[in-house]
Interface confidence: medium
Amino acid sequence: MMTGTIETTGNISAEKGGSIILQCHLSSTTAQVTQVNWEQQDQLLAICNADLGWHISPSFKDRVAPGPGLGLTLQSLTVNDAGEYFCIYHTYPDGTYTGRIFLEVLESSVAEHGARFQIP
């Protein structure tokens, strides 16, 4: 039975040219995390594998940094970076947990963090 929940940074805003941390946290389960996939829409950005460590897609290598923790840091943001991001936690023995983050990239300097929310 899957008892865990994923807490994410929720809906977030950031300025064009700035940077943002995408963060997910898996709680309420003793399952072992074997891998975390980070996706933008259906494009694979990065994986953090328990054995292999971090790998960042070559397309994003200049602007994406691993961490903190199992999170991902996006730098030099452009308007094309706006949209949905998913963290997919592969765990044993529970299976997979998915969290969603929506990023808005603003032209102006009125960027505010949205509230944290939970995805079961």
């Epitope: 594998n49 054995d51 292999l52 397309s59």
Partner: antibody, heavy 120, light 108 residues
Amino acid sequence: QVQLVQSGAEVKKPGASVKVSCKASGYTFTSYGISWVRQAPGQGLEWMGWISAYNGNTNYAQKLQGRVTMTTDTSTSTAYMELRSLRSDDTAVYYCARAGWEQQLGFDYWGQGTLVTVSS
Amino acid sequence: AIQLTQSPSSLSASVGDRVTISCRASQTIRSYLNWYQQKPGKAPKLLIYAASSLQSGVPLRFSGSGSGTDFTLTISSLQPEDFATYYCQQSYSTLPLTFGGGTKVEIK
């Protein structure tokens, strides 16, 4: 263009070891993982494991744990797969393959294959 | 480990036929499903990645569909060079990566 060139066919006795090489060219070697896949005569494809060319970290198929070692030499852009304590059922064609990021880790380029025959 | 079940294991078809091959995963793999073609004595060749994206250089008669657990490879009009064995592979979980058992497409 991207190329993976493997070493030549090998004939080994049961209990011996074999080391197959896979020389990569045409791309940044350390940006991708290399997987090894084998195919016994008349059988399907079996994933053996994967090595990160970035940091040398590995994960191996459970059934081969303890018998297989995968390494890379970044100075020559070469991956190696060593299989020890060979048995007759290890007779197979061994392939190296690059895991493509844009292909969500699908194997976009393959070596030509190395036939390893285990026979007394 | 995620299991992939291909069906049928073999099929006979004629040039010009529409051919469909199924791949079912034992749990959801979202769109992390790839299709390969392998001819005797040759390395596999990536045809479709991410369930429905055509790999560069692959003819448009090949297409893929599905997400979650059920996926299909379709060859709209079978050509003589398409007689081969086709494999699906999941890359959703790399512990381990797994292949389907293969589907052999033979000449009727």
